[in-house]
């Protein structure tokens, strides 16, 4: 079948990094500068991605693979293949329409990206607040108030802080 296909379509013999040039009797021609073909049998080469402005080149384009970009310091990637660069904020802030803004009371962000999330409500788990939350840190929940009553034989060690889920990007 492969041999038949080759006889029918000479372009199938053109390897990655080349294209089947209709203008030259379907000869396999190398991809021109700043273009690539990642698979064989291509009739055109794709234009290489250019990393401009806040995007910087992580991997140069080659004749067989596209360039890859990431973001300059102070920005981070969003989207598949780093299709966007978003400005960092400080911990304890979130990026809004008006720029980096401090987290409202009762919320926190321990990263330079993402949104401010509510502090854990310790009472929902029947626990008490061991360490207060801040703009940068979630509260730490401790033993339940009953465990701390006088005469309790032992104090249970504080529960580890709940790992906050990452905010959707």
């Amino acid at each position: 079948f492969e041999r038949t296909r080759s006889l029918q379509d000479p372009c199938s013999n053109c390897p990655a990094g080349t294209f089947c040039d209709n203008n030259r009797n379907q000869i396999c021609s190398p991809c021109p500068p700043n273009s690539f073909s990642s698979a064989g049998g291509q009739r055109t080469c794709d234009i290489c991605r250019q990393c401009k402005g806040v995007f910087r080149t992580r991997k140069e384009c080659s004749s067989t693979s596209n360039a890859e970009c990431d973001c300059t310091p102070g920005f981070h990637c969003l989207g598949a293949g780093c299709s966007m660069c978003e400005q960092d904020c400080k911990q304890g802030q979130e990026l809004t329409k008006k720029g980096c803004k401090d987290c409202c009371f009762g919320t926190f962000n321990d990263q330079k990206r993402g949104i401010c999330r509510p502090w854990t409500n310790c009472s929902l788990d029947g626990k008490s607040v061991l360490v207060n939350g801040t703009k940068e840190r979630d509260v730490v929940c401790g033993p339940s108030p009953a465990d701390l009553s006088p005469g309790a034989s032992s104090v249970t060690p504080p529960a580890p802080a709940r790992e906050p889920g990452h905010s959707p990007q």
Partner: nanobody
Framework: QVQLVESGGGLVQPGGSLRLSCAAS????????MSWARQAPGKGFEWVSG???????YYTESVKDRFTISRDNAKNSVYLQMNSLKPEDTAVYYC????????????????WGQGTQVTVSS
């Protein structure tokens, strides 16, 4: 093809003013949001200001009340009027399309100019 050409940079004393211009071509300017970014010596990029096609404007906190972004769709140009300049405003200023319409966010399809140097020094 898309071209963005900045001009108007230069050396200015603290407290002085400059007006940057960005001449755009190769795309439908009137329906495109535009932005300004800057890169200070040895530092990363910073999102400075943006303007929607309808004229709504946005600024980073450090330039609010000092910088004004505007556009002239008839001239395919966007401007950045910079007043009360400070030494920390020293940077290369870039004009860029702003397809995401999100503060501090650019996409891979956005286009960038080559930049114009602004130096604030006595």
């Amino acid at each position: 093809q898309v071209q963005l050409v900045e001009s108007g940079g230069g050396l200015v004393q603290p407290g002085g003013s400059l007006r940057l211009s960005c001449a755009a071509s190769g795309f439908t300017f009137s329906s495109s949001a535009m932005s300004w970014a800057r890169q200070a010596p040895g530092k990363g990029f910073e999102w400075v200001s943006g303007i929607y096609s309808g004229g709504s404007t946005y600024y980073t906190e450090s330039v609010k009340d000092r910088f004004t972004i505007s556009r002239d769709n008839a001239k395919n140009s966007v401007y950045l009027q910079m007043n009360s300049l400070k030494p920390e405003d020293t940077a290369v200023y870039y004009c860029a399309t702003w397809g995401t319409l999100r503060f501090g966010v650019w996409a891979e399809y956005d286009h960038w100019g080559q930049g114009t140097q602004v130096t604030v020094s006595s």
